[in-house]
Interface confidence: medium
């Protein structure tokens, strides 16, 4: 379906492109001795990027620092010294740069201040940081600013004394709303949810921390949830991790009514050891982990119904090292109901898996063709794909990135990756799919850092080395060949590549430093490849695709969730701009239902290879522990439930006697004496 | 109404050139592709090619790259689709039909050809 | 190119009756078919898009359904108006190619 990569030799050489490519360059020397780098895009096709450089020395008992800021509005192709607009003030790199949400061009830099002083001090730029107003803050922040996602004047962040502060005019005043809060977030329609300690400590009270909730900003608060351990919002789930009356055990709950009403998820209880994490929510189901007792580094993926109560087992011994761990868990967002994520073996090897159907099945990647397989395969002719992601660049294996999709580049996936039984410590190369990772193909030889561009248009690499580099490759035709471009004539110790988030930009940045004998200088080179796709693409640049597709002569080929989707994509042959504006066109057809588009409701299961659920023989007769919207009450199922996000229509409807489930809540979550309402007065 | 008026029938000689003319009304004609097909006397239908009338692409059957060319005034909103080195075999019936295809988005770009010229006929004899 | 293949060349159908015409392509064209009707010194008019969506204005006796390679055309009971010449034309890629017509004429 697609040959090796070539690089180079009689493969679609383009014409002129290295005059075009030297003609769109542009160098940058950073007039400056800083050690570190940090580098933001400030809104959505503006084009503006800031730069802040900094530079400590660690003194005996104060340090010293000096900042930089730069700033650029032709996507890095120039940058001026701005560093007067912050007054020459040290910035604290561990904040970050707090861009506003969207294109509201907002902008808080946080600065170091003396250690006597009252409280921390911040820069606020509303105008793309053409401008920085100076604000001194009532108090010494202890994370980042938060801006609310509904509307960027609304700030929220919490102090070094575990107080809530509130700002609702980008930052000028601040009100402290609420203390000893321990972990506080934005929610929807500018709500804000977050943990207070009751008696000691944030960590001594864990497991007994108050679930607050306020609409109004801070005048009016609700107690939502008591017995906390932590709480988290994934899609339109709102969940927390409650503490059980009789033991050391602790639960999810989930609402879906921003606290007003709880229900107990289905899911096993976890001990102090072990943990939960949403891997990925969206607006119609969670994905969820649960850590297996023990040290083991593993645990289980459970997928949900809509209403994040029922779950269904979808992969076991799910590698997820610790809290906070690595997991390798990626959604692949160049299509739909993909994700890819790692699995420990009981030998202790890692082997990737992938689902095509959000969780519903998951399997081996297949072998790229014309590849061989590695030493970790038993068979040399039978084996898989295994893709590096977080845990390989964890354990400083020579994997430079993790795995890369864009939804605007439909069906690509870049990664690192090696051929055999498992995961391989070797030196890897990087493979790359055009169809969402059902089919692979060997991109480039050993590791490389990788970008798209154009919303796949054009795809950028530079090898992995530790050794100075000047030479960047690039393919139009995602993948298949490579041209390789000489940027500089002297080669600098390659940083990052920095592209505008989106893969819509036809420009790259290769950042990195040249090094003599004391000096470290920081230099960036942009290269815009609008040169390389001369024209606009025209409709017959394009050409179909039917997402998902295993079997063209299948009436339902394609179907996954119940719908299909067909694309149209780039040729490969097709050397054309995609453009800024460029939408993917899609046009959806809906399936008929089969049994494949209903999960088991509660109390049912599917036993293994069959398709029909059953009645699960340990709840016949039995009160269940379940607790619906926190009451007693009937749950009535015929044992199937429509997976969510499916929209199969007619089909097949799996109809059986409506059951009774009588259930008992075991929950004093709710518990109505526990729940209340405070004004902030 | 949405409509295609083509221009008037043509005889020419071998070795000569053709200009057919295809004039829009009642949508906006840059936002559609133009396609030309043609159908030779008692024979089926033979796509010949397509303009994007937004930015003046051209895609042209390999039938008969080198001796079509496709063009467009938009500000008369009218499509040209000229034909060269005429042999006796190009003699037919020559339509423009619109494309559902938006020359913007590409959405329904599988949806075929909606509306159609009333056709010209260009007979080559010597 | 893809090419697309009609049959039967000729249908003789009494009024009144079902008609089933036939279009195969050489690969999948997904649902990305369309269907027109020509009848003698008209232009073509677009009756199904898309495989099984009708055209606006276009009676519900004219029905289209299939994916992939094969396609199907069915008029469940013909008007005398219906007489005609029918193409097939997939428009998954470019070129756009046409099948070579099927007539349907009075039996």
């Known amino acids: 379906r697609r040959g090796a990569p070539a690089e180079d030799q009689d493969c679609g050489r383009l014409p002129d492109f290295i005059a075009k490519l030297t003609n769109n360059t542009h160098q940058h020397v950073f007039d400056d001795l800083s050690g570190s780098v940090s580098l933001s895009w400030v809104g959505d096709s503006t084009g503006v990027i800031l730069v802040l450089t900094t530079f400590q020395v660690p003194l005996v008992i104060v340090s010293f620092g000096q900042s930089k800021l730069y700033r650029s509005e032709d996507y890095g192709k120039n940058f001026k010294d701005i560093t007067n607009l912050i007054n020459n003030t040290f910035i604290r790199t561990e904040f970050g740069m707090a861009i506003g949400p969207e294109n509201s061009g907002k902008v808080i830099l946080t600065a170091e201040v003396s250690g006597g002083s009252r409280g921390g001090r911040v820069f606020r730029s509303s105008d793309f940081a053409k401008n920085f107003v100076q604000t001194d803050l009532p108090f010494h922040p202890l994370t980042q600013m938060m801006y609310s996602p509904q509307n960027s004047d609304y700030l929220l962040a919490l102090s070094t004394e575990n107080g809530l502060w509130v700002s609702k005019n980008f930052g000028e005043k601040w009100e402290e709303i609420h203390k000893a809060v321990c972990l506080a977030k934005w929610g929807p329609n500018n709500i804000i949810f977050f943990t207070t300690h009751v008696n000691g400590s944030c960590k001594a009270d864990l497991g007994a921390l108050e679930l607050w909730r306020t609409s109004d900003l801070g005048k009016t608060f609700k107690t939502i949830g008591v017995k906390i351990y932590s709480f988290g919002l994934g899609g339109r789930f709102l969940f927390a991790s409650v503490m059980a009356d009789k033991d050391t055990t602790r639960r999810i709950h989930v609402s879906t009514d921003q606290g007003d009403t709880w229900s107990m998820a289905q899911l096993p209880s976890v001990g102090q050891e072990q943990f939960y994490s949403i891997l990925a929510a969206n607006e119609d189901m969670v994905f969820m982990h649960v850590d297996e007792p023990g040290d083991t580094g593993f645990g289980t993926i459970f997928t949900s119904d809509d209403r994040g109560i029922v779950y269904s087992k979808s992969l076991d011994r799910h590698l997820y090292t610790t809290t906070g761990g690595e997991t390798d868990f990626t959604n692949v967002t160049s299509l739909r109901g993909v994700y890819i994520t790692s699995t420990l073996s009981e030998d202790n090897s890692i082997q990737s898996m992938i689902t095509f159907d959000q969780g519903g099945r998951w399997e081996h990647l297949r072998k790229p063709e014309n590849s061989k397989c590695d030493a970790t395969a038993k068979n040399k002719n039978e084996c898989s794909l295994h893709i590096h992601a977080s845990y390989s660049i964890s354990q400083k294996l020579n994997v430079p990135m993790a795995p890369l999709s864009e939804p605007n580049a439909v069906g690509i996936v870049i990664a690192h990756g090696s051929v055999g039984d498992a995961i391989s410590v070797m030196v890897p190369d990087v493979y790359i799919s055009d169809d969402g990772g059902y089919s692979w193909a060997k991109m480039l030889e050993g590791p490389h850092y990788y970008t798209i561009l154009d919303s796949g248009g054009i795809i950028v690499a530079i090898e992995h080395s530790n050794r100075p580099i000047n030479v960047i490759k690039f393919s139009t035709d995602e993948g298949q060949c490579w041209q390789s471009y000489v940027f500089t004539q002297e080669p600098i110790y390659f940083t990052g590549l920095a592209s505008e988030p989106g893969a819509r930009s036809m420009n790259i940045s290769i950042w990195g430093f040249t090094e003599s004998f004391i000096t470290r200088q920081w230099v960036s080179y942009t290269v815009d490849f609008k040169d390389i796709l001369e024209r606009n693409c025209e409709e017959d640049d394009y050409t179909t695709w039917l997402a998902h597709s295993t079997d063209p002569g299948d009436y339902k080929d394609g179907c996954i969730l119940g719908y299909k989707e067909q694309f149209l994509r780039l040729r490969k042959s097709s050397v054309c701009q995609n453009g800024r504006d460029y939408v993917v066109a899609k046009q959806p057809s809906v399936c008929p239902c089969s049994l494949e588009d209903f999960l088991c409701d509660f109390g049912y299961f599917r036993p293994e290879n069959a398709s029909e659920c059953v009645e699960q023989p340990e709840l016949k007769g039995h009160e269940l522990e379940f607790c619906l919207y926190g009451k007693e009450e009937h749950l009535t199922t015929n044992g199937y439930r429509k997976i969510p996000g499916d929209k199969c229509q007619g089909g097949m409807n799996p109809a059986r006697e409506v059951k009774d489930l009588k259930k008992k809540c075991t929950s004093n979550f709710l518990n109505p004496t526990k729940q209340n309402s405070k004004s902030n007065s | 109404q949405v409509q295609l008026v083509q221009s008037g029938a043509e005889v020419k000689k071998p070795g000569a050139s053709v200009k057919v003319s295809c004039k829009a009304s009642?949508?906006?004609?840059?936002?559609?592709?133009m396609h030309w097909v043609r159908q030779a006397p008692g024979q089926g239908l033979e796509w010949m090619g397509s303009i994007n009338p937004n930015s003046g692409g051209t895609n042209y059957a390999q039938k008969f790259q080198g001796r079509v060319t496709m063009t467009r005034d938009t500000s008369i909103s009218t499509a040209y689709m000229e034909l060269s080195r005429l042999r006796s075999d190009d003699t037919a019936v020559y339509y423009c039909?619109?494309?559902?295809?938006?020359?913007?988005?590409?959405?329904?770009?599988?949806?075929?050809?909606?509306?159609w010229g009333q056709g010209t006929t260009v007979t080559v004899s010597s | 190119e893809i090419v697309m293949t009609q049959s039967p060349a000729t249908l003789s159908v009494s009024p009144g009756e079902r008609a089933t015409l036939s279009c195969r392509a050489s690969?999948?064209?997904?649902?990305?078919l369309a269907w027109y009707q020509q009848k003698p010194g008209q232009a073509p008019r677009l009756l199904i898009y898309g495989a099984s969506t009708r055209a606006t204005g276009i009676p519900a006796r004219f029905s289209g359904s299939g994916s992939g390679t094969e396609f199907t055309l069915t008029i469940s009971s013909l008007q005398s108006e219906d007489f005609a010449v029918y193409y097939c034309q997939q428009v998954a890629n470019y070129p756009r190619t046409f099948g070579g017509g099927t007539k349907v004429e009075i039996k």
């Open positions: 039909a619109r494309g559902v295809g938006s020359t913007v988005t590409l959405a329904y770009y599988y949806y075929g050809m909606d509306v």
């Open positions: 009642g949508y906006t004609f840059t936002g559609y592709y």
């Open positions: 690969q999948s064209v997904s649902s990305n």
